[in-house]
């Protein structure tokens, strides 16, 4: 996911003023004016705000990266929602990119969970049912696996 327009000082002139702040705050979809007297609408498809706020600038919409699909567009009150394309997933500890899901489990293991946009396939040992925590171990023969994935131990 990338941020649009990362040079805030180049930001275009604000849109028309809509309302006065309530107790110093502006409603979702707006930001506060430079003198604090007005609430200014965010620009649809460009920026947004999700809560009552005293932000001087609306938050810039994120754009979905290649390898992601847009589930819902950016509106003045909600950021873009992006999701990894089918066959790829994003891990919590590396959210900056979508990684290819493995195509199969290591020898002696069975698949118990499918590839989702949020998780790789899940494999367990046939006998013990112990989950495999990561990708294919280097020492073990594999059924099929995606290239370039580091080895990790079973749990």
């Amino acid at each position: 996911i990338t941020q649009q327009d990362l040079a805030p000082q180049q930001r275009a002139a604000p849109q028309q003023k809509r309302s006065s702040p309530s107790e110093g705050l502006c409603p979702p979809g707006h930001h506060i004016s430079e003198d604090g007297r007005d609430c200014i609408s965010c620009k649809y498809g460009q920026d947004y705000s999700t809560h009552w706020n005293d932000l001087l600038f609306c938050l810039r919409c994120t754009r979905c990266d290649s390898g992601e699909v847009e589930l819902s567009p950016c509106t003045t009150t909600r950021n873009t929602v992006c999701q990894c394309e089918e066959g790829t997933f994003r891990e919590e500890d590396s959210p900056e990119m979508c990684r290819k899901c493995r195509t199969g489990c290591p020898r002696g293991m069975v698949k118990v969970g499918d590839c989702t946009p949020w998780s790789d396939i899940e494999c367990v040992h046939k006998e013990s049912g112990t989950k495999h925590s990561g990708e294919v171990p280097a020492v073990e023969e594999t059924v099929t696996s995606s290239p370039g994935t580091p080895a990790s131990p079973c749990s």
Epitope: Q3, P8, Q9, N53, D54, L55, L56, F57, L59
Partner: nanobody, 127 residues
Framework: EVQLLESGGGLVQPGGSLRLSCAAS????????MGWFRQAPGKGREFVSA????????YYADSVKGRFTISRDNSKNTLYLQMNSLRAEDTAVYYC?????????????????????WGQGTLVTVS
């Protein structure tokens, strides 16, 4: 508790320049997101400029864009505002402020009108 002390104000002719400084103490300066505001005689507080702790995100009010430049020196615990091409309407008390509840989204800092730690201000008169 952070303390802020502005300096550099004074009387200047239209078209002239001034450089304001804001020395901060009592906190880790490099962790502070900061800004400049001003208040003209008989008017309310107005946002001038803001800068993130790293200096990567910089914002200006439309009225000063292209004339004022905000910067910071984290090694000197000092925030600056270089003001060029000054106009009569820039006459105001200039305040340095700290955003103690900063908003970050996607790694980008967004300043608030309600910055909550203030210096005592320095008067700039353009006449």
């Amino acid at each position: 508790e952070v303390q802020l002390l502005e300096s550099g104000g004074g009387l200047v002719q239209p078209g002239g320049s001034l450089r304001l400084s804001c020395a901060a103490s009592g906190s880790t300066f490099s962790s502070l997101d900061m800004g400049w505001f001003r208040q003209a005689p008989g008017k309310g507080r107005e946002f001038v400029s803001a800068i993130s702790r790293s200096g990567d995100n910089i914002y200006y009010a439309d009225s000063v864009k292209g004339r004022f430049t905000i910067s910071r020196d984290n090694s000197k615990n000092t925030l600056y505002l270089q003001m060029n091409s000054l106009r009569a309407e820039d006459t105001a008390v200039y305040y340095c402020a700290v955003d103690s509840q900063p908003t970050y989204s996607g790694g980008v800092y967004y300043p608030r009108y309600g910055m909550d730690v203030w210096g005592q201000g320095t008067l700039v008169t353009v006449s």
